[in-house]
């Protein structure tokens, strides 16, 4: 009897994981085995597929063989027992085009209300990604273990954390890689748990914001309890963006060392032009908090992105608002050629609720204010331009009293 | 492979300093932490200190600060830990070792063992 | 500075037991904890690291686990070769400090 060909061959690329299957033509027929050949492009002669020679199970593997990537292959397949079968020709592919991207490794660490991830890709040194190795990005999904509801996180990096999470609760996430530049979404890792920490004695601190005051920078946070010491910490940001990369070299702030303060001031020349990430730590002497989230520090915008100034002219029931330019050392306003959109927080001296407002205008009214009361406002710059979304710090809070109740305007 | 390997054994006076080196192979220690851990006969491991030799930023025990000093070559790919005004209770074997912020100490160098007696 | 105590100096177990080595941190350092083995004349070798991952070559009859303050080495069906002292270390604050070390005795 003849032997049929095999039919349906499936070539799966997972990293440098190379697997054929394919389906026997013929069940009837027992004690086959199976032998592929392979071609390059540009060549005339078939080679043996080391790996996928006499298999009698319906699955082989040539991750051994030693091809180039981005060269086009063609395979071969025949039944053999005592005689063969003719050969059926595989259409041919690009291994590194029919490559999917395997789930990374991923590593976890836990604190009372964050998690660290690290990941890394699932085959170290892998010939497949090897002129891509370093623009692999990282896409998750976590949940709590008790709710399911999930939530992602896109555009991730090697190493990544996750604040504001519930102390003692069990977390899980599953992570994948995509290269960008090549169109490529991998496979999701598998689930990984962990349960976050008793909460920590000690909060971290909380409200990071930098301003410029003459040739300084005014590092500011807040913080719960009094009597504490802090400790600043900056990384070049780009830092987060190399895969190999683990060990971050968290540097110290000379002038932001042991601060009994919830502030700190320390030159401009302290960092070159650049993209600065910043934490604080706490410490009572005896226990020490965890850090604080990470704020992004831009030199450039910082430098140039000051609180707005603005006068206040109080009526019975709202305050007219004139935003004028920011005022740098020596009284001099600053020229600020490029478009801004103020954020205005107001609120009743006696009362924690805020309203805002959002205005392009330098003239703003705030309404339906009461008569004989004092209200405090503050504000704030942001530009408009999508690519350089910054905002300035809040202003210092200006209070003012509303006229009695029988003002004109 | 990945290796630390520590100069020899030292022998020195009370009072005098001793200078302990440490050297990587297998990989560049610009890209990590070296750490140094004291050891004395019989008892626990005590964390002495650390550099950064990219930069030379150094991080010290506070029972070690002002006596010991670390101090990289990266030219040699060496990191050295000098301890100066010895006594007896600096008797101890000084291990050096690897910190990469994601497997902790993963390689050790084979311990450097200083005896100090008059 | 964290203090690490491993209460218990010495532990007696006998081949095929199951052994479990704890150790207390004086706050919370999260999971950033490491355990070693240290044989005599030998530089310690590190075991388990963030609290509960092996480092590669290491059996898996070795596991680590816990969170915050509270941490535990356990060795299943315990070997001859485990014979040795067993530290801990918080790396989650300067100074990095280890516990005072378990040394695993066999009966």
């Known amino acids: 009897k003849n032997l049929k060909s095999p039919q349906k061959v499936e070539v799966d690329i997972i990293d440098d994981n190379f697997i054929l299957r394919w389906n026997r033509s013929d069940e009837s027929v027992g004690n086959v085995t199976f032998s592929f050949d392979y071609q390059k492009t540009g060549m005339d002669n078939w080679i043996k597929l080391s790996g996928c020679q006499n298999i009698t199970s319906t699955k082989c593997n040539f991750s051994s063989l030693k091809l180039n990537v981005y060269e086009e292959i063609k395979l071969r397949i025949r039944a053999e027992k005592e005689n063969t079968s003719s050969w059926y020709e595989v259409d041919s592919f690009t291994p590194f085009r029919k490559a999917q991207i395997g789930p990374p490794e991923v590593h976890l660490e836990a604190e009372d209300k964050a998690i660290v991830i690290h990941i890394s890709p699932g085959t170290k040194d892998s010939v497949m990604w090897a002129l891509d190795g370093l623009s692999f990005t990282y896409s998750l999904v976590i949940w709590k273990n008790s709710s399911g509801v999930e939530e992602r996180i896109e555009n991730i990096y090697s190493r990544h954390k996750i604040y504001k999470l519930s102390p003692e609760t069990t977390y899980c996430l599953k992570v994948k890689a995509a290269l960008l530049t090549s169109w490529k979404i991998g496979v999701y890792s598998p689930v990984h748990c962990i349960k976050t920490t008793v909460e920590n004695e000690l909060p971290p601190p909380e409200n990071i914001e930098v301003s410029v005051q003459n040739q300084n920078y005014v590092l500011k946070w807040d913080y719960t309890y009094a009597n504490m010491t802090f400790q600043v910490q900056w990384l070049h940001a780009f830092l987060k963006r190399n895969p190999g990369n683990h060990l971050y070299k968290w540097k110290q702030i000379p002038d932001c060392e042991n601060v009994k303060t919830t502030q700190c001031v320390f030159p401009q020349n302290v960092f070159q032009k650049g993209i600065y990430l910043l934490r604080v730590q706490a410490s009572d002497g005896n226990n020490t908090s965890f850090w604080s989230e990470e704020i992004k520090f831009d030199t450039e915008i910082q430098a140039f992105l000051l609180p707005p100034v603005f006068n206040i002219r109080s009526l019975s029931d709202s305050f007219h608002i004139y935003i004028g330019a920011p005022k740098q050392s020596g009284n001099t306003p600053v020229i600020q050629d490029y478009p801004l959109i103020y954020e205005i927080i107001f609120w009743e001296n006696t009362s924690n609720a805020e309203r805002k407002i959002i205005e392009k205008k330098t003239d703003v009214t705030v309404p339906n204010l009461k008569p004989l009361t004092v209200y405090c406002v503050k504000a704030r710059a942001h530009t408009m331009d999508e690519k350089l979304n910054k905002s300035s710090v809040f202003s210092d809070a200006v209070c003012e009293k509303t006229k009695p109740g029988n003002t004109s305007k | 492979e990945v290796q630390l390997q520590q100069s020899g054994a030292e022998l020195v006076k009370p009072g005098a300093s001793v200078k302990v080196s440490c050297t990587g192979s297998?990989?560049?220690?610009?890209?990590?932490?070296i750490h140094w851990v004291k050891q004395r006969t019989e008892q626990g491991l005590e964390w002495i200190g650390r550099?950064?030799?990219?930069?030379?930023?150094?991080k010290y025990a506070p029972k070690f600060q002002g006596r010991a000093t670390i101090t990289s070559d990266t030219s040699s790919n060496t990191a050295y830990l000098q301890l100066s005004s010895l006594t007896s209770g600096d008797t101890a074997v000084y291990y050096c070792?690897?910190?990469?912020?994601?497997?902790?100490?993963?390689?050790w160098g084979q311990g450097t063992t200083l005896t100090v007696s008059s | 500075d964290i203090v690490m105590t491993q209460s218990q100096k010495f532990m007696s177990t006998s081949v095929g037991d199951r052994v479990s080595v704890t150790c207390k941190a004086s706050?919370?350092?999260?999971?950033?904890v490491a355990w070693y083995q240290q044989k005599p004349g030998q530089s310690p070798k590190p075991l388990i690291y963030?609290?509960?991952y092996r480092y590669s070559g290491v059996p898996d009859r070795f596991t680590g686990s816990g969170s915050g303050t509270d941490f535990t080495l356990t060795i299943s069906n315990v070997q001859s070769a485990d014979l040795a002292a067993y530290f801990c270390?918080?790396?989650?604050?300067?100074?990095?400090?280890f516990g005072g070390g378990t040394r695993l005795e066999i009966k």
């Open positions: 070792a690897r910190y990469d912020g994601y497997y902790c100490f993963d390689y």
């Open positions: 297998g990989f560049n220690i610009k890209d990590y932490y």
């Open positions: 550099i950064d030799p990219e930069d030379g930023e150094t």
């Open positions: 706050q919370n350092v999260g999971t950033n």
């Open positions: 963030s609290t509960s």
């Open positions: 270390q918080q790396y989650n604050n300067y100074p990095y400090t």
